[in-house]
């Protein structure tokens, strides 16, 4: 055959489906790879061809869509599934093609069997909830598309293994699941079930999805540095290590750059003639706080390095701070025999 | 004198994988956050990941995200991209840049990645 | 994502004339707001950071204003090696975005 443009594996649509449900599955080609739609390619005369390779096999079949009550069956750019079987997994090509022109793309579908609790190893979005932060929803994902809008389905939702009713703060409203003002134990995964009828069938649909409880962007405040701090001073004898740690802590923010670095006599560590590393570490709260800190370190600290300034500096998308740290060089303790004894008059 | 060094890029197939490599010199490459950052063909900049001094955080534009992981070797002073699934959108000047907290202050010559379909 | 909108897309000026160029944010990134130059063939360079501090061996024509959501890159006398393609870049948020870049060009 014709040379067939090959977009290869799209491994960024990783599909994963729950076994014995539902699955539409519409061809990437349209969505992420050619710039005219399915309408436009069927107008022009092209044909949209589906064909999957089996896991752990390396040869490309046709798919059977001639399989007992339609269970796999095309419509237009979408392949469906009513329902998936467990061997249903694999890579799948669909490729357009007429004549002259060839385009095709594969990409893998997994599909995957959960427990009663509705644990699997899918890959769960997560969806952030500000904290105490008034009404917010989520919404039952990616149910679109699989039955008509005169069709009225059921809804349950749970959260893990505990189907939601009577929840203090959570209710549940058809497609959408309402917190009332999110805590922290409103952390968790969270699914609901849709169930809808089609020809004389009864389909589930299975969509989880995980809550973070994170800070508000109305308590969310400007960098603060815990240290350097007025209460530390960093007292060194020349040829000692000079440790100064800052550490910051940033409120959560959706999507902030938070920074933090030192600056020696105004300038860039680097751009001072001296020795110095600096080591960070970040951790975060349960709210998705964040506290980094850098640890400045000079290994053989001279009396000049003493009388330098030192500082700590932090910014968010809140804004910027800045604190110094106390450094001075430590007063030798006297010897007795001499300087001691001058202070007593003894010559 | 502060420099970086690109390495890595070259013709690679869409679908395939390629990696790049930055060299770093002339400054404590574990203080600072580095990017890559890159530029199409007669198009604008870029911006495809960043990761802190520590390696501890990592951020990836939303174009990159699944396919593109950033990674660095303090200890090699060495910044790399390893980039999966790449497609024709990919081709690109792939610039390695030093990201200090107020811009990008150090920039590579650049790496050419090709990809072909 | 912030998206920055650099204006005009192309100017075309005289050494010696004033070149003022914009960038508008679709949201407020503070003053944490980089200009860069960059001329063909060659890596971009940093020029301003901050909105307004030039940045390590930048001549003193290039100077940048303003903060939030408007900003503006003036170069007071052109010379030659300043006709280039000229791009803003917001560091308040991830991911990190540029403007599309002014082109500016000799009359």
């Known amino acids: 055959s014709e040379r067939c443009d090959d977009w290869g594996l799209d491994t960024m649509r990783q599909i994963q489906v729950f076994e014995d449900e539902p699955a539409r599955i519409k061809c990437p080609l349209f969505e992420h790879f050619l710039k005219f739609n399915y309408s436009t390619a069927h107008s022009a005369g092209l044909t949209l061809i589906w064909y999957w390779t089996r896991q752990d096999r390396d040869l490309e079949e046709p798919i059977n869509f001639r399989l007992p009550e339609n269970r796999i069956s095309k419509e237009k750019d979408v392949l469906w599934f009513r329902p998936t079987l467990l061997n249903d997994t694999g890579n799948y090509t669909c490729m357009l093609r007429n004549t002259t022109y060839c385009s095709k793309v594969a990409f893998p579908l997994e599909v995957v069997q959960k427990d009663s609790c509705f644990n699997s190893p899918m890959k769960l979005p997560v969806h952030k909830l500000y904290i105490e932060y008034g009404i917010q929803r989520i919404t039952c994902p990616n149910v679109d598309g699989y039955f008509p809008s005169s069709v009225k389905p059921t809804i349950t939702w749970y959260m893990g293994c505990y189907k939601i009713q009577n929840f203090n703060n959570v209710i549940p409203e058809g497609m959408n699941l309402s917190f009332l003002i999110a805590l922290i134990s409103n952390n968790g995964n969270y699914t609901c079930v849709v169930t809808y009828p089609e020809n004389g069938r009864t389909f589930h649909l299975t969509r989880t999805l995980t809550v973070k409880v994170v800070g508000s962007p109305k308590n969310a405040v400007p960098p603060v540095i815990h240290s350097p701090n007025d209460h530390v001073v960093y007292e060194k004898e020349p040829g000692e290590e000079l440790l100064i740690p800052c550490t910051v802590y940033f409120s959560f923010l959706m999507d902030s750059r938070n920074e933090v670095w030192w600056t020696i006599d105004g300038k860039k560590p680097d751009d001072i003639t001296i020795d110095v590393t600096i080591n960070e570490s970040i951790s975060h709260s349960r709210t998705e706080d964040e506290t980094r800190t850098q640890i400045l370190s000079i290994k053989k600290v001279t009396s000049e390095d003493l009388k330098r300034s030192y500082v700590c500096h932090a910014r968010s998308a809140k804004g910027e701070v800045a604190k110094a740290a106390k450094v001075k060089q430590k007063v030798p303790a006297p010897r007795y025999t001499v300087e001691l004894a001058c202070g007593f008059g003894a010559t | 004198e502060v420099q970086l060094l690109e390495s890595g890029g070259g013709l690679v197939q869409r679908g395939g994988s390629l990696r790049l490599s930055c060299a770093a010199s002339?400054?404590?490459?574990?203080?600072?956050?580095m990017s890559w950052v890159r530029q199409a063909p007669g198009k604008g900049l870029e911006w495809v990941s960043s990761i802190s001094g520590s390696g501890d955080s990592t951020n990836y534009a939303d174009s990159v995200k699944g396919r593109f992981t950033i990674s660095r070797d303090n200890s090699k002073n060495t910044l790399h991209l390893q980039m999966n699934s790449l497609r024709a959108e990919d081709t690109a000047v792939y610039y390695c840049?030093?990201?200090?907290?107020?811009?990008?202050?150090?920039w590579g010559h650049g790496t050419t990645v090709t990809v072909s379909s | 994502e912030i998206v920055l909108t650099q204006s005009p897309a192309t100017l075309s000026l005289s050494p010696g004339e004033r070149a003022t160029l914009s960038c508008r944010a679709s949201?407020?990134?503070?003053?944490?707001l980089a200009w860069y130059q960059q001329k063909p063939g060659q890596a971009p360079r940093l020029l301003i950071y901050?909105?307004?501090n030039r940045a390590t061996g930048i001549p003193a024509r290039f100077s940048g204003s303003g903060s939030g959501t408007d900003f503006t890159l003036t170069i007071s006398s052109l010379e030659p090696e300043d006709f280039a393609v000229y791009y803003c870049?917001?560091?308040?948020?991830?991911?990190?975005?540029f403007g599309q870049g002014t082109r500016l060009e000799i009359k």
């Open positions: 949201q407020s990134v503070n003053s944490y």
């Open positions: 002339g400054f404590t490459f574990s203080s600072y956050a």
């Open positions: 901050d909105a307004s």
């Open positions: 840049v030093r990201d200090y907290y107020y811009g990008m202050d150090v």
């Open positions: 870049q917001q560091r308040s948020y991830w991911p990190i975005t």
